[in-house]
Interface confidence: medium
């Protein structure tokens, strides 16, 4: 009989029902929007908005300040009041839109939907290791502002994204809104701008470049701005918009637009479509050939990344990536598979395919047919010319034109669709040590840090605890401040550290030792914790063997017994090969020999289940007793393994010593030729791992075997004449004297 | 006009290391991935490693991966080749082209011969 | 395995239109392919990107008589009326980046004579 171990699935070794406390601010309404700063001189805040307030918070996430931003209209309102006696324009509540800092001063400067967009300008006053608002400066300025030309209005209630570039003395503004015809004819915001902010802070400086939805299109076609940011020499905006002008609307994919950070100008401004699939590595019939496409970008962010994460994307480490998780459409309704999926975009890859795609469109060979694109924003055209016109006329460049190029950026789920059902609705990338954590929020208002990894079948998981009990998404921007990142769900900001919770979701020694040393985990006698958590006993260098079962569960008093152990930290190596002395088994008061490894029978493990074995022939001592005793393993004096050694003692109980007695044996004749089915009939017949029944010295071929009975097929006989037989358990003759006689036939 | 001038070949012996070096000039070098093909006596091409415009990211053909390192000096116009562990099946004539989107090599230069022999 | 074949060698009379075929492997069929000419004692030079389709644009100083056409997996290069200027080495590549790795692969080229 062969009889293996089974398998205990990976996620045994881990528990993410566990409950932790992080610490968290309660705002009083919704988080509209939150941004953090560290100043240096070890000063730091947390700036938390929500409808019609703003809230300072201190490192310790404690309330530092409040200041009301509306309704618009409300004598109330702090902000309102920086810009003079009003009426500003119509009553109403303020949603922050635009929460951004601005290095340069530094500021922090907020954008509402109320009061046309406009926004307010706060200076940081350093208060000890907290961070005050100085009074607010409002950005605007009446007198060169109209309806139609409007350069103090920035946010768009239909959503705005902003990253504030210095450029020499001055900052300017990096502006995308979303407009439908509504939004575009009540001053004119536009789609995306740059603009310099006035250095007398009374707004921003008229005669700005911008790009906008044209009229025919504002109805159709919706441009959703998910994520920007600067890194180089550029400025990116994430887009969600429809494939096509022409096409149904509601067939949407996702975009990254690049501007110069350089230049103050849109002439270079490309835009480049992202492609994110997944790819699974069995592909089902009928599964589309390039994988399943994920077209609209839920939420992303941009990182270095670490050394196994860039030798997997062909990158060096340290270069910057762009992370999205991406969903089939708008509702991110589940699809064959996985709800949401993670795609990495290299950003020199993404600027190398841009360069080339302009190359593409200005330089010779012309391409015919090739479409200069963002038929929304300009005149349609074909490269090489610029938009609506037919030719290059001597003066202009094809390249100081807008441009999409023609080519898209494709690459596939990062995880391999190993996040199924979870609907991912936040993110943010680290790099720690070497490895690159993916931080992501939940649509249930967990928090999943993972590391991004690209050649397993499974998630290696830094933690996944809930965030609260409300359950409420984790909202889409997050911020990271010293060593946390702070998440925004329902009312609250959680603060997060970067390097997990804790470690009480590890349940045992073998995963507490193996997780990442960034994490500070130890062992502490019963549970895995950081030292903080459990003094005194608290150790990250050994962890002692682990059984879970045993098999067979008797065996003879008399006789060996082949025992097959099973559990974890046996060996710490997958040849499963031990050195002399190191392992001590004892049942009772009897050892068991441990037996080499059958190299036949090894078998590899997915990394997703484990199990070891170790074998070892019993031979009970003289003194040995009948009845139930232990099993135990100790092993000493083993050769570290890569991340703990294994040292110390493992007892279960529930291994029992028997007698086999051998009570009636029938027939006792039968042909000579053989084949006589026998039936032994006793107690303790089937103790044990080996039994063999002998008639004249050879063995009966065993049919059954149970705890009160055998059945064997007799041999053939030499002659005919009355031979002895006996049973063996465990190579010991079970007593008592039986005769078997064989007949002619 | 696109000039790609390649330096840098010879005789060495086998387990020697040598760097190519390749010159451009009548294009925005910085914008471009470039990469390394060679061609074998027997006129067989065989492309050996890329690199993108910004220099981050780099693709090698299999049997060179470790051996060979390509890498790029956009404020020189100049891409390299360092070439370590070399064996007699790297003996080739080797070019520098200019990629458009790394998938093809619109131009080349006159290539430099790296012979391993002992 | 990404594969390309070229039959290698084809001779054409002065003045007739020349067809030089590559074949991509089987699971490959939908790819775009570039193809190179090689003179005599020169570096290969850029022909044209050639689609599954057929289109093609043709690289810098190529003359109109070289085109492009596409069937299945075999992808094809005609030039009309051959001139001496013509014999030279023409071989296809191909492209493809798997799970964030790039390849490139050559075919092994077809060495083209005008008697």
């Known amino acids: 009989e062969d009889w293996q171990c089974p398998r205990t699935p990976y996620a045994a070794s881990r528990d993410f029902d566990v409950k932790y406390v992080v610490p968290s601010f309660s705002a009083g309404g919704l988080v509209q929007a939150m941004v953090t700063y560290e100043g240096d001189r070890n000063e730091s805040a947390v700036f938390v908005a929500i409808r019609n307030r703003l809230h300072v918070l201190g490192p310790d996430l404690k309330s530092v300040q409040s200041l009301a931003t509306g309704p618009a209209g409300d004598p109330g309102c702090q902000t309102c009041a920086a810009c003079g006696p009003g009426p500003h324009g119509p009553p109403g509540d303020t949603d922050t839109k635009v929460l951004v800092l601005d290095p340069a001063l530094p500021a922090l400067v907020s954008c509402g939907s109320s009061l046309q967009g406009r926004c307010f300008l706060h200076d940081l006053e350093p208060q000890g290791t907290a961070v005050h608002l100085a009074a607010p400066a409002c950005l605007f300025s009446a007198h060169h502002n109209r309806p139609d030309d409007c350069p103090d209005c920035v946010a768009s209630p239909l959503g705005t994204r902003v990253t504030v570039v210095e450029q020499g003395q001055a900052s300017y503004f990096y502006v995308a809104s979303s407009l439908d015809a509504a939004v575009a004819a009540s001053f004119s915001p536009r789609s995306v701008s740059i603009r310099r902010l006035k250095a007398d802070a009374s707004g921003f400086a008229p005669g700005f470049v911008a790009l906008s939805v044209l009229p025919k299109h504002l109805v159709s076609y919706s441009i959703e701005y998910v994520h920007s940011f600067h890194t180089g020499a550029f400025v990116y905006f994430l887009t969600v918009q429809p494939a096509s002008v022409t096409d149904d609307p509601s067939a949407l994919h996702t975009r990254l637009a690049r501007l110069s950070a350089t230049e103050p100008e849109l002439g270079d401004y490309r835009e480049l479509v992202l492609d994110c699939r997944f790819a699974p590595k069995r592909r089902r019939r009928g599964a589309p050939e390039g994988g399943q496409p994920y077209p609209v970008l839920r939420v992303a962010h941009s990182a270095p990344v670490g050394a196994q994460l860039a030798t997997e994307l062909s990158i060096a480490e340290g270069q910057e990536v762009l992370f999205g998780v991406f969903v089939t459409g708008k509702d991110g309704g589940p699809g064959v598979g996985p709800n949401s999926v993670v795609c990495a975009f290299p950003i020199d890859l993404l600027d190398t395919l841009i360069d080339e795609g302009v190359e593409r469109c200005c330089e010779s060979p012309v391409h015919p047919g090739l479409r200069r694109g963002l038929d929304f924003f300009q005149s349609p055209s074909f490269c090489p010319n610029p938009p609506g016109l037919e030719a290059l006329s001597p003066n202009t460049s094809c390249r100081h034109f807008p441009l999409l190029v023609s080519s898209s950026f494709s690459r596939v789920d990062l995880f391999n669709g190993l996040l199924g059902p979870v609907q991912v609705t936040a993110l943010y990338v680290t790099r720690l040590d070497n490895v690159t954590v993916a931080h992501m929020g939940t649509m249930d208002g967990r928090i999943l840090q993972v590391e991004l990894v690209r050649s397993l079948n499974y998630l290696l998981y830094v933690s996944n605890f809930s965030l609260g009990d409300s359950g409420q998404p984790v909202q889409r921007d997050v911020s990271r401040l010293g060593d946390h990142l702070l998440f925004a769900s329902g009312d609250q900001v959680f603060q997060v550290p970067i390097q997990g919770p804790g470690c009480r979701h590890f349940l045992t020694c073998g995963r507490c030792l193996r997780a990442w040393h960034f994490m500070g985990c130890g062992w502490c006698g019963n549970m895995c914790g950081q030292q903080k958590e459990c003094p005194g006993s608290w150790q990250q260098d050994h962890c002692p063997p682990k059984l879970t079962e045993f098999h067979p569960h008797s065996g003879p008093l008399r006789g060996s017994t082949r025992l097959t152990l099973c559990g974890s930290n046996f060996y710490l190596h997958p040849s499963g090969l031990v050195p002399e002395g190191t392992h001590q088994v004892t049942v009772g008061q009897s050892p068991c020999r441990p037996l080499p490894k059958d190299s036949s029978k090894l078998r590899p493990v997915p990394r997703k289940d484990f199990v070891e074995e170790f074998e070892c022939e019993l031979e009970p001592l003289g003194t040995q007793a009948v009845g139930p005793t232990n099993v135990s393993l100790t092993v000493t004096n083993m050769p570290p393994g890569k991340h703990f050694r294994v040292d110390g003692t493992s007892v279960l109980r529930g291994f029992s010593f028997m007698e086999p007695v051998l009570i009636a044996v029938q027939p006792l004749f039968g042909p000579r030729a053989g084949g006589t089915c026998l039936t032994l009939e006793g107690q303790s017949l089937s103790v044990g791992t080996s039994r063999a029944v002998l008639v004249n010295g050879t063995e009966c071929l065993l049919a059954r075997v149970s705890e009160g009975q055998l059945l064997c097929a007799t041999p053939p006989g030499a002659t005919v004449a009355s031979v002895p037989l006996s049973l063996q358990v465990g190579g010991a003759q079970v007593p008592g004297s039986w005769t078997f006689q064989y007949r002619e036939d | 006009e696109v000039k790609l001038v390649e330096s840098g070949g010879g005789l060495v012996k086998p387990g020697a290391s040598l760097k190519l070096s390749c010159a451009a000039s009548?294009?925005?070098?910085?914008?471009?991935?470039m990469s390394w093909v060679r061609q074998t006596s027997d006129k067989r091409l065989e492309w050996v490693a890329s690199i993108s415009s910004g220099g981050g990211t780099t693709y090698y053909l299999d049997t060179v991966k470790g051996r060979f390192t390509i890498s790029r000096e956009n404020a020189k116009d100049t891409l390299y080749l360092q070439m370590s562990g070399l064996k007699s099946e790297d003996t080739a004539l080797y070019y520098c082209?200019?990629?458009?989107?790394?998938?093809?090599?619109?131009?080349w230069g006159q290539g430099t011969l790296v012979t391993v022999s002992a | 395995q990404l594969v390309l074949t070229q039959s290698s060698s084809a001779s054409f009379s002065l003045g007739a239109s020349a067809k030089l075929t590559c074949t991509l492997s089987?699971?490959?069929?939908?790819?775009?392919i570039e193809w190179y000419q090689q003179l005599p004692l020169k570096p290969p030079k850029y022909v044209m990107e050639?689609?599954?389709?057929?289109?093609?644009s043709t690289g810098v100083g190529i003359p109109d008589r070289f085109s492009g056409s596409s069937s299945g997996a075999d992808r094809y290069l005609t030039i009309s009326n051959i001139q001496p200027e013509d014999e030279a080495i023409y071989i296809c590549g191909v492209g493809e980046t798997i799970e964030d790795q790039f390849v490139y692969v050559f075919g092994g080229g077809t060495k083209v004579t005008v008697l």
């Open positions: 050639l689609k599954k389709d057929g289109s093609h």
């Open positions: 089987s699971q490959h069929t939908t790819y775009t």
């Open positions: 082209t200019r990629g458009q989107w790394l998938l093809k090599f619109a131009y």
């Open positions: 009548g294009f925005i070098f910085s914008s471009y991935g």
